[in-house]
Interface confidence: low
């Protein structure tokens, strides 16, 4: 067992080294480890094959370090890994697209608060078991087409607190099991009418605190399971172009936030849902 760590076998074979001031992944981690806790240290680099010997590893926590670089082959051989937490490593900024390849059993991936500026093509390829993906509080500006395409079992996708300016047509392709999509506190000004086409099981959609002045109801039509919708804190324009959204909100049987109008001035601060149809005039 590495000097700064505690190793024990029950209830699972565990190597636990949190908050020890470690500057590198320690050598001598027992190969039988099922859980490795390295959070809260000063680790800046995860070299290739750092955990290759740990074939039984299911949980790996590397959050709250100072990671600036993760080699593409850092997690090679971890076929049984279920939970990987890399969050709160603000210097990371980018992740090689091959980093997570081969992690076919991964069900939870934390990449929040990592200073990520983009999601490279194929970053999440092959993660068929993934259920929870935490990408909030980064610096993401765009959602590339088909980024999440292989994530057919994903139920929770957290993208809030980024700089995303639009939701393109293919951003969420393949997310047939998605239950919660959190997109609040971004800069979203435009949602493609077909952006949510695959989200038939979505129950919670947060779009509050963005830059939306309009939202095509065609985008909302596929959301048959939707129960919770938050649209507040957006610059909604409540003129005739808002009539389809107004009509959709009248029929919506779930729970929705207020939709306060910004324009025209005479309706500023009023809730779109509570307006009469003939209030929505002029284009």
């Amino acid at each position: 067992c590495p000097g700064a760590c505690v190793c024990y076998n029950e209830p699972k074979v565990t190597t636990s080294c949190p908050q020890q001031g470690l500057q590198a992944v320690p050598v001598g981690i027992p190969a039988a480890s099922q859980r490795i806790f390295l959070h809260g240290n000063r680790i800046s680099h995860v070299p290739a094959a750092s955990f290759r010997a740990c074939r039984n590893l299911t949980i790996l926590w590397l959050h709250s370090n100072v990671l600036a670089r993760i080699d593409a082959a850092a997690f090679t051989g971890l076929a049984l890994l279920e939970q990987l937490d890399l969050s709160d490593n603000a210097q990371l900024r980018s992740v090689d697209p091959a980093t997570f390849h081969g992690l076919g059993r991964l069900h939870t991936l934390h990449l929040d608060r990592c200073g990520l500026q983009e999601l490279g093509p194929g970053l999440f390829r092959g993660l068929a078991a993934l259920q929870y993906l935490y990408l909030q509080d980064n610096a993401l500006q765009a959602l590339p087409d088909d980024t999440f395409r292989d994530l057919g079992n994903l139920t929770h996708l957290f993208l809030h607190g980024n700089r995303i300016s639009s939701v393109p047509e293919r951003a969420f392709r393949g997310l047939h099991s998605l239950d919660r999509l959190l997109l609040h506190q971004n800069r979203v000004a435009h949602v493609h009418p077909h952006a949510f086409r695959d989200l038939g099981r979505l129950m919670t959609l947060y779009l509050f605190a963005n830059n939306l002045s309009a939202l095509p109801t065609e985008a909302l039509a596929p959301l048959r399971a939707l129960q919770y919708l938050r649209l507040n804190d957006n610059p909604w324009v409540c003129d005739c172009r808002a009539r389809p959204l107004w009509a959709w909100l009248q029929k919506f049987r779930g729970s929705s936030s207020e939709v306060p109008c910004s324009l025209p001035q005479r309706l500023a601060g009023r809730d779109l849902k509570r307006l009469a149809a003939n209030d929505l005039q002029g284009c």
Epitope: P11, T108, D137, Q185
Partner: antibody
Amino acid sequence: EVQLLESGGGLVQPGGSLRLSCAASGFTFSSYAMSWVRQAPGKGLEWVSAISGSGGSTYYADSVKGRFTISRDNSKNTLYLQMNSLRAEDTAVYYCARAPHYDLWSKYYFRGMDVWGRGTMVTVSS
Amino acid sequence: QPVLTQPPSASGTPGQRVTISCSGSSSNIGRNTVNWYQQLPGTAPKLLLYNNDQRPSGVPDRFSGSKSGTSASLAISGLQSEDEADYYCSARDDSLNGYVFGTGTKVTVL
């Protein structure tokens, strides 16, 4: 030293309002979610509300939903709990606590509340 | 109301092993990890264990935890007089979209 210090408690009549504050020091306040937990005299702990580090996500126990509002001012390192329409059953010591996690959606683990204040007493009585 | 059930009291003599159970459901303990808190008389609660069995720095190794299905337990081996306190289990609850505490167990050192 990491510290949390609650204030704002006192005696208030049923139906009244009170605003609790929690001043944080010794850590990067905006990086942590925060919670309010209360304890009625002689009773157990009850989670009241939580807020994410940015303040963008808030959560409430059913018993206070619609009456209490949690907020934070990261520039002042301060957490707040605005309590309206107070009832006798809200009488308790109110603790603020640091939660080193992302938000309460985190399904597979929640690392607990690792720093607590000493609490402030709220009494609702006529 | 607490949705995690604990025995109201437990006791032992110094040096003995005491175990406290915590029973929940599929929406809390069944799907989420368990934390334990210790509250010494007249003080604020203190985090004792997180992630079912992890000890924060400074917590003695005589405290251990485990989880199985919808139940969890806290064991204190080598009971000491300073362990006399109230102990609470807790977990996230998916159906309530919040955090729940157990009913609490008062540990008395005889």
